[in-house]
């Protein structure tokens, strides 16, 4: 599967999402991620599928990927823990926890995000924020600065229609509308934030972006609370 982009969004306010991480391979942005604890970043399992021979690092405190910023720091990864049930050919259990080489230096631009522990669906229509450094248009342009977009949550029944994702959306997944505004290539692993709480992680499945009949798919973190807690313990 591809690395999941912010399509139809806009540049984010600099450092207003201090939980935002860029998972990097050999010094280049690969996927999004979200700081969930001082020493742990949550991302998508498929992001590391092709990273066997490369150096994986995590960039925190960044707005621009290329420009120097006082809050920016690149961390080595001590341990990568994909969900044990994640598989290359499915979107299920597409979660990855990355343990940083040391605790992140926290500040206004680097701060963990509270994540949802109550295993209950987000109400359809709820506006949630997704951010990332993924491609920003159909040409495939990659932005230097963090982009974001607000997307309404889509009910599972609609998302599972034959014309949409045809039953692939389990109770451990959620959908958001994708009509011209969407997450996509390069955004996988990034956060879907509703009401200031992490609710979902952008999946890495093969999907056309910006097509309303192919809604964005997000892994529900609340459904994996036990696993996250067990790894972070």
């Amino acid at each position: 599967p591809p690395r999941g982009r912010i399509l139809g969004g806009r540049e984010a306010e600099a450092h207003a999402r201090p939980y935002m991480a860029s998972v990097q391979l050999n010094g280049a942005h690969l996927c999004g991620g979200v700081l969930v604890a001082e020493q742990w970043v949550l991302s998508a399992a498929h992001c590391l599928e092709d990273a066997a021979d490369g150096k994986v690092q995590v960039l925190l405190g960044a707005h621009s990927l290329s420009q120097p910023e006082p809050s920016k720091r690149l961390y080595d990864v001590l341990r990568a823990v994909p969900h044990p049930d994640s598989q290359p050919d499915t979107i299920d259990h597409d979660l990855l926890l990355l343990q940083l080489s040391e605790k992140a230096t926290l500040g206004p631009a680097v701060r963990p995000l509270p994540w949802q522990r109550v295993d209950r669906d987000v109400a359809p229509g709820t506006l949630c924020d997704v951010a990332g450094w993924g491609i920003v248009n159909h040409a495939g342009r990659r932005p230097d600065s963090l982009q974001h977009v607000l997307l309404p949550v889509l009910d599972r029944a609609t998302c599972n229609r034959r014309t949409h994702h045809d039953g692939a959306i389990t109770e451990r997944l959620m959908c958001a509308e994708s009509n011209r505004r969407d997450s996509c290539k390069g955004d996988s692993g990034g956060p879907l934030v509703c009401g200031g709480v992490l609710e979902g992680v952008v999946t890495s499945g093969s999907r056309v972006c910006g097509n309303r009949k192919k809604p964005g798919i997000y892994t529900r973190v609340a459904s994996y609370a036990a696993w996250i807690d067990s790894v972070l313990a």
Epitope: R3, A139, G140, K185
Partner: antibody
């Protein structure tokens, strides 16, 4: 340094097929989109289609549906354009481009009997 | 599909002169690109997303517009700017090019 090296000029017979290559260096094609654009003699630019090399998903302009097939080999970091059932109308220069920001030098295809 | 009409088809300008060419879309767009192509060369990206300068492009080039009307401006024409310029929209599939404006040096 980003570079796109395209295959040499082709002279082909009507009805035949041709496969053009675009070898990329300085970046990983899996991380972007690869597009093909053509330009007929003394004409403007025409978008043919694109591929997301990470998953093989393609999109074609209606005029090139059934005529063009875009593929990618991520192990060799190369994108391909196959053109089938060629006619004189397909005589053109074919460009590959990475997300429209870096372009290959173009491959001239001449269809003639 | 969205039709992009560029005008004028051909124009000429003297060195140092300000040059403006337009691209009119049959429907509203927001992702407009501009390219420069010199004879015998590949196209070169000049402007992306209406007004952003691509890497290495001189600051005398600028893009503007909204809705269905867009323009490319060269603040001071230089001999090396003689080329054909194409607009392209990235909003609605299929992603279409304009027919081009050929800019000649006087």
């Amino acid at each position: 340094e980003v570079q796109l090296q395209q295959s040499v000029a082709e002279l082909v017979r009507p009805g035949a097929s041709v496969k053009l290559s675009c070898s990329a260096s300085g970046f990983n094609i899996k991380n972007t989109y690869m597009h093909w654009v053509n330009q007929r003699p003394e004409q403007g630019l025409e978008w043919i289609g694109r591929i997301d090399p990470a998953n093989g998903i393609t999109k074609y302009a209606p005029n090139f549906q059934g005529k063009a097939t875009i593929t990618a080999d991520t192990s060799s970091n190369t994108a391909y354009l196959q053109l089938s059932n060629l006619t004189s109308e397909d005589t053109a220069i074919y460009y590959c481009t990475r997300a429209m920001d870096y372009w290959g030098q173009g491959t001239s295809v001449t269809v003639s009997s | 599909q969205i039709v992009l009409t560029q005008s004028p088809a051909i124009m000429s300008a003297s060195p140092g002169e300000k040059v403006t060419m337009t691209c009119s879309a049959s429907s509203s767009v927001s992702y407009m690109y501009w390219y420069q192509q010199k004879p015998g060369s590949s196209p070169r990206l000049l402007i992306y997303d209406i007004s952003n300068l691509a890497s290495g492009v001189p600051v005398r080039f600028s893009g503007s517009g909204s809705g269905t009307s867009y323009s490319l401006t060269i603040s001071r024409m230089e001999a090396e700017d003689a080329a054909t310029y194409y607009c392209q929209q990235w909003d609605t599939y299929p992603w279409t090019f304009g027919g081009g404006t050929k800019l000649e040096i006087k």
